[in-house]
Interface confidence: low
């Protein structure tokens, strides 16, 4: 399919002029290469009219230009003095005419409507509010006031200052005598059709002496705005509809075959399957006006789009509207990230986040999509060092990989954590992308014990069990904060007061606290990664007490004490403990157990890899 | 654009409380889609932050020298934003500004897209 795109009809009046945007790829080599506006042959040939290079035809002499704006994506024909032969079928396009890279355009040149004298035009919108002003003499002001319509070549009642009023104008027109003193009288009709354009003529009197007045009524449907985005990137539809509709519901539909027109989102709650998770309808200002952003933009998003108002939340005739032609470029410079990642009760996930490489230094957001009336996305974490307070010991947004990436974990999974999120920066608008979190059966890969007691002054050591299938990766501990994760050092990386040590044998890497602190207490998060890519992470809270007096019970110990078949879901561990006091033989065979919980693991997941679109916790 | 226009501002005594009030508008979103913050400038001194809310009102934060003093609420339904301050004194004396963020950042480097013209506070000792 090609990336180019433009306007599909363009319409005019003779002697008027048009002004035609065709968008590309704004990629080095497009931005550089011949752009040309050619005219279809009846024979399948596109003759060219217009190009970059400087050329113009003899039948465009001095009415025609063509400029490119590569910084934007998009060039500009003007064409002036139209005349009914430019009427046809052209191409804008870059590169050779036949090559393809190009976009079908229909140019519909009219003639001017022909008039009759002391007619007065009104030009409006669609949906809107016109009002016809009548002169009429003082000897026709106690005379019957009337509006008519030509329909053919018969005149046809619309409303008569007696009660008159078409049935096809009920409820949304109104006959206005002015004060005495004016010599005038007005028909306001309201949410306009097209239907209602054509010649009306308003009269004050009946017989030949009547005053009467012309006017010429032209309904415009909105011209769409162009609007290219990238696949997988965002766009936002602002719409501003006045503020006599402000307090009408306004909606978001999506032209289908023929005049139909599918609900996207409305003020009234209506939101379409296909949009979950991607979409947010911005509250409305007091004029009316509102926006509607959707993200993770998909080739099927492309088409024709309608903002308006209407008591009904959806489009019905006369319903005010503004209109957008929206072209998703599969040339995408957003690169492909999983749409799902997948995740287990009580474990975690890794979300890789892409962003507009050439804005490294913007902030970086998470926020979580909620869908309750129009849909909002609360911020739950930004590069900046802010976490939301219930997300605090586990949630982080790290800034690695880097270079159009950056990534966010969340631990402690719960079913409450399954939604759509939104990776987002304060740059570029259109980088806003979409995930979405399941959690699936399972249990996590990384075990550690549930709550963990140091005391100050002592040592404290913390295990962290993980299987097989992370033996390669880079295993770590680190204590978390706002605004990040920082990673403590390894044994062999020289002395310090906490350091991880790595048993390979046994898969446990231990984070040790020598001399604890106060300042020691906190979240610490045990996890495995690649090069810059995270994986599965699992917190411990380190709470720190002071040391208790001689003979004094330790409240730790008495945990350990559960009945054999109690589960305690504090620890991994403690399963494995409770069974030793069962049969103290289990102990010999407790890496035995281990091994084959392991294997177990690494056999699930090696069936559930995901698709293409989709990322499994230790995402990759 | 957003409009932002602070009132409330006046001459009182140390230990007095007084309340500024910032209302929004504009023709851009709506003003509960906005964090907004308060900051101030005394005198030969720069701009700093005070006090910062979300759209919701549900998260705040404050600058160490007005924790404990100031409190920042907002009214979405009439676009306003509020700083409640008690227990003044003389070194709070200063322009005060109402910013509005398309985003929250709770810190002291309130991302401000948006300002108002400011509204003066005199404390006598």
């Known amino acids: 399919k090609s990336p180019i795109f433009g306007p599909e009809e363009v319409n005019s009046v003779e002697g008027n002029s048009v002004s035609i945007t065709c968008y590309y790829p704004p990629t080095s080599v497009n931005r550089h290469t011949r752009k040309y506006w050619c005219r279809q042959g009846a024979r399948g040939g596109c003759i060219t009219l217009i190009s970059s290079e400087g050329y113009v035809s003899s039948k465009y002499a001095g009415r025609a230009n063509l400029t490119n704006f590569p910084e934007n994506g998009t060039f500009v024909v003007n064409i002036a003095q139209l005349s009914q032969d430019d009427s046809g079928r052209y191409k804008c396009g870059l590169g050779i005419n036949s090559r393809g890279l190009s976009f079908d355009v229909s140019l519909e040149v009219s003639q001017g409507p022909g008039l009759l004298n002391d007619t007065k035009v009104y030009t409006v919108d669609l949906g809107r509010t016109v009002t016809i002003n009548c002169p009429f003499k003082t000897e026709n002001a106690q005379k019957r006031k009337s509006l008519y319509k030509q329909i053919g070549l018969y005149p046809v009642l619309v409303i008569d200052s007696s009660g008159y009023v078409n049935p096809n104008y009920t409820g949304r027109i109104r006959l206005d005598i002015q004060g005495t003193g004016q010599l005038l009288f007005s028909v306001v009709i309201n949410q306009l059709r097209l239907s209602d354009a054509g010649q009306y003529l308003c009269q004050a009197g009946d017989d030949s002496n009547s005053n009467k007045k012309n006017a010429d009524l032209q309904v415009l449907k909105p011209e769409p705005e162009l609007v290219y985005e990238d696949l997988r990137g965002s766009v936002t539809f602002h719409c501003a509809l006045g503020p006599e509709v402000a307090n009408v519901a306004k909606f978001l539909c999506r032209q289908s075959s023929g005049e139909n027109c599918d609900v996207v989102v409305n003020t009234l709650g209506k939101r379409a399957p296909a949009f979950e998770g991607r979409i947010l309808l911005n509250p409305q200002d007091k004029d009316g006006s509102f926006s509607v952003v959707i993200t993770g933009l998909r080739k099927e998003d492309a088409g024709r789009y309608l903002c308006g108002a209407h008591s009904d939340g959806q489009l019905q005739e006369g319903s005010p509207i503004q209109a957008w032609q929206l072209f998703v470029n599969e040339e995408s410079t957003i690169p492909r990230s999983p749409t799902v990642v997948k995740g287990v009760a009580g474990g975690s996930v890794a979300v890789l986040c892409p962003y507009n490489r050439k804005e490294s230094k913007s902030i970086k957001y998470w926020c979580l999509w909620e869908g309750a009336q129009n849909g909002r996305c609360p911020l739950l974490v930004d590069s900046e060092g802010w976490v939301k307070a219930q997300y605090e010991g586990r949630l982080s947004l790290l800034e690695e990989p880097g270079n159009g990436t950056f990534t966010v974990i969340l631990n402690q999974l719960t079913s409450r954590d399954a939604g759509f999120y939104w990776c987002l920066t304060n740059g570029d608008t259109l980088w806003r992308t979409t995930v979405e979190i399941k959690i699936i059966e399972g249990e996590p890969n990384l075990k550690v014990p549930g709550n963990v007691t140091a005391v100050l002054g002592e040592t404290l050591k913390v295990p962290c069990h993980f299987p097989c299938k992370f033996s390669s990766y880079e295993k770590y501990w680190c204590k978390w904060n706002n605004t990040g994760c920082q990673a403590l050092p390894s044994q062999d990386e020289g002395p310090s007061k906490a350091f991880v040590n790595c048993d390979e044998n046994s898969r446990l890497v231990s984070l040790t606290l020598n001399l604890v602190t106060r300042a020691d207490e906190g979240w610490y998060w045990c996890g495995v990664k690649q090069g810059h890519f995270y994986g599965e992470t699992a917190a411990v809270y380190v709470a720190v007490e002071e040391r208790k007096a001689a003979g004094s019970r330790d409240v730790s110990l008495a945990k350990a004490d559960a009945a054999p078949d109690e589960k305690v879901l504090d620890s991994g561990f403690r399963e494995i403990e409770n069974k030793a006091i069962q049969d103290p033989r289990l102990f010999a065979e407790e890496k035995a157990v281990a091994d084959t919980r392991d294997q177990a693991d690494g056999s699930r997941a090696s069936v559930d890899s995901g698709s293409s679109e989709e990322q499994g916790g230790s995402s990759r | 654009q957003v409009q932002l226009v602070e009132s409330g501002g006046g001459l009182v005594q140390a230990g007095d409380s007084l309340r500024l009030s910032c209302a929004a508008s504009g023709r851009t979103l709506s003003f509960d889609t906005y964090a907004m913050g308060w900051f101030r400038q005394a005198p030969g001194k720069e701009r700093e932050f005070v006090a910062s809310?979300?759209?919701?009102?549900?998260?705040?934060y404050y600058a160490d020298s007005v924790k404990g003093r100031f409190t920042v609420t907002r009214d979405n339904a009439k676009n306003t934003v509020t700083l409640r301050m008690n227990s003044l004194k003389p070194a709070d004396t200063a322009v005060y500004y109402c910013?509005?963020?398309?985003?929250?950042?709770?810190?002291?480097?309130?991302?401000?897209?948006?300002w108002g013209q400011g509204t003066l506070v005199t404390v006598s000792s």
């Open positions: 910013a509005a963020a398309q985003y929250y950042r709770s810190g002291t480097s309130f991302p401000a897209n948006y």
């Open positions: 809310i979300d759209w919701s009102g549900g998260t705040t």
